[in-house]
């Protein structure tokens, strides 16, 4: 039977009210309000907590019986829709100890992960997986691509206890792999000896000059040289004018700096390598992935342009249960929410063919009325006769 | 990478006002987060502040709230700072630095470090 | 407000391990990075996020950071590596800076 800690679908009207709060950590935080956004597959079904202010932080959350995932698999999972077509924010979830006071929530609040989609800019598409050890936010080394699209998505994390994860998208596996090998949570199990250096008579040059190579003695050249061919101007006047000197030229017979030629160093070593030895520091850690408090799960976002829609919240500690319940939610109601969406792009398309048209006949009316004012009054004449004195209707 | 170019020196009267700017290049403005920095002669590093462009909000330290204003002009992509009521222990250069912006939060750029720097502004408040 | 402190100087002879640390109240659960600053010049990030080099940033700047310290460590120290060098962090909303360390070169 699988435990489910926290599970939110917001099917209960204004229900939700109850069960999420708001943090009065600062007076001016953006509000969330329930909703299915301008697109869906199902109103009721769809419906989830949107962001409504722009340009706001938001911090919400809600609290449930606390539970420890030591000794079993931890899965957090829910569903995000940018259908603002999102500039900068954040759509991710943080799982708080039940030690958070839930009316201070806040950017600074400590909590055990952080999940889920952030797009910022050009640069910020990425999924974040944020553990906190000993302390410490630390961030995942891979760069797990988000959706960036106006559906909804579902994300997934689990977190086994053989210290392995899994970053699901839509339920199909983007990332996987080792806590340790994924996260710095630990030192490096080698470092360099510190008591190492490199030896003084170490010879990394690859080559060397060759000491038998001399400079042959006619190299030394000038660079430039008084053109041979140039001759004084007959109005030149030394008094006047002083001393006349040829221009210069390039001399054809300049060979530049001369360079001994190259050779293999005998005394090459190769690029000295730092020796490695075991880190001291170095320990391994079989609990990583294990807390001893999960009680509050939160959003604290900031948003440029609001519109983001949270909903089907799960956690709990079956894989398969998880995967149900995403099909079962995201997957019934995916297909009518892009029919939908698909649906509304073609009305405004042809909205704007028509407004468009209707822009374009305006305009021929209004230059045909300039024309009429703008050229000579007419006489009333049959049509025929009109064209036959060159007359031309517009 | 962005190239950040900051503006000329400055000698200021006590009292009076400063606006520095800082214009980036070779980047996306809005993928960074801009932080302002002083040393002052023989002292050490001092964040004033910084800006997201993106968010088009500023952050203060503690020390200069009140004082200094930051703002960003995404059109040019140029940073500003401003630092009012000018005294003679406000003699310092000044430097504005990028951190690349890797979320949406505010202290994501934290993270980061601040990985290019401008050549530094010399402000010089003397009567 | 939060602390950093750093040892005004530290000497190394060339070829040799130079360590500068950086103490602050559990500074091990925060991120901390490392500049070079030379004289008449703007600061350089040499290691971010505690342990990580910037491209271009020679192998031999390494970082670690736990419990209430957190070190920046050249190894095999070079002539050109002498600089004041500063840590800093994110600590209580807004962005910290050690006093600064002045590494010298002997010889």
């Known amino acids: 039977e699988p435990a489910v800690y926290f599970k939110e679908q917001f099917l209960d009207g204004d229900g939700w009210t109850s069960r999420w709060i708001e943090s009065k950590h600062k007076s001016d935080f953006g509000k969330f309000v329930l909703s299915s956004g301008k697109f869906y597959g199902d109103e009721e079904k769809d419906k989830g907590l949107q962001t409504s202010q722009d340009a706001r932080f938001y911090a919400l959350s809600a609290s449930f019986e606390p539970f420890s995932n030591k000794g079993q698999t931890l899965v957090v999972q829910f569903t995000v829709k940018h259908e603002q077509n999102i500039d900068c924010g954040g759509g991710y979830v943080k799982l708080f100890p039940n030690s958070l006071d839930q009316t201070d929530m806040h950017g600074d609040s400590e909590y055990n992960i952080m999940f889920g989609p952030d797009i910022c800019g050009p640069g910020t598409k990425k999924v974040h997986v944020i553990f906190n050890y000993k302390g410490k936010n630390v961030l995942i080394n891979k760069d797990i691509r988000c959706k960036d699209d106006e559906f909804t998505h579902l994300y997934t994390l689990i977190v086994r206890p053989d210290n392995t994860y899994e970053v699901k998208i839509d339920n199909s596996q983007v990332e996987s792999g080792s806590l340790e090998d994924d996260w710095d949570f630990l030192p490096p199990k080698k470092i360099k000896d510190p008591d190492a250096s490199k030896p003084e008579d170490w010879d990394e040059r690859a080559k060397i000059d060759d000491p038998t190579d001399s400079k042959p003695e006619d190299w030394d050249k000038p660079e430039h040289i008084p053109d041979p061919d140039a001759k004084k101007p007959e109005d030149w006047d030394e008094e006047m004018d002083g001393e006349w000197e040829p221009p210069v030229i390039q001399n054809p017979e300049y060979k530049g700096e001369w360079k001994p030629r190259q050779i293999d160093n005998p005394d090459y070593k190769g690029t000295w390598i730092h020796p490695e030895i075991d880190n001291p520091e170095y320990s391994p850690d079989p609990s990583i992935y294990a807390y001893d408090n999960f009680g509050v799960l939160g959003l604290d976002l900031w948003q440029v342009k609001s519109g983001t829609i949270f909903d089907n919240f799960l956690i709990t500690n079956d894989e398969a249960y998880a995967e149900e319940f995403g099909n079962e939610t995201w997957g019934v109601t995916k297909a009518a929410e892009k029919q939908m969406k698909d649906k509304q792009d073609e009305e405004q398309r042809t909205r704007r063919m028509m407004r468009t048209k209707m822009r374009m006949r305006r305009m021929r009316r209004t230059r045909r009325k300039m024309r009429r004012k703008m050229s000579p009054a007419r006489p009333r004449t049959s049509c025929r006769e009109a064209c036959l004195q060159g007359w031309t209707e517009a | 990478e962005v190239q950040l170019v900051q503006s000329g020196a400055e000698v200021k009267k006590p009292g009076s006002s400063v606006k520095v700017s800082c214009k980036a290049s070779g980047g996306t403005f809005s993928s960074y987060a801009i932080s302002w920095v002083r040393q002052a002669p023989g002292q050490g590093l001092e964040w004033m502040g910084g800006i997201i462009p993106i968010f088009g909000t500023a952050n203060y330290a503690q020390k200069f709230q009140g004082r200094v204003t930051i703002t960003a002009d995404e059109s040019t992509s140029t940073a500003y700072m401003e630092l009012s009521s000018l005294r003679s222990e406000d003699t310092a250069v000044y430097y504005c630095a990028s951190s690349p912006l890797r979320g949406s939060g505010w202290y994501w750029h934290y993270y980061y470090g601040m990985d290019v720097w401008g050549q530094g502004t010399t402000v010089t408040v003397s009567s | 407000s939060y602390e950093l402190t750093q040892p005004p100087s530290v000497s190394v002879a060339p070829g040799k391990t130079a360590r500068i640390t950086c103490g602050g109240n559990?500074?091990?659960?925060?991120?901390v990075h490392w500049y070079q600053q030379k004289p008449g010049q703007a600061p350089v990030l040499v290691i971010y996020q505690d342990s990580k080099r910037p491209s271009g940033i020679p192998e031999r700047f390494s970082g670690s950071n736990s419990g209430n310290t957190a070190t920046l460590t050249i190894s095999g120290t070079q002539a050109m590596d002498e600089a004041d060098y500063y840590c800093?962090?994110?600590?209580?909303?807004?962005?910290?800076f050690g006093g600064g360390t002045k590494l010298t070169v002997l010889g």
């Open positions: 559990k500074i091990g659960t925060k991120s």
């Open positions: 800093q962090a994110w600590g209580s909303s807004t962005v910290v």
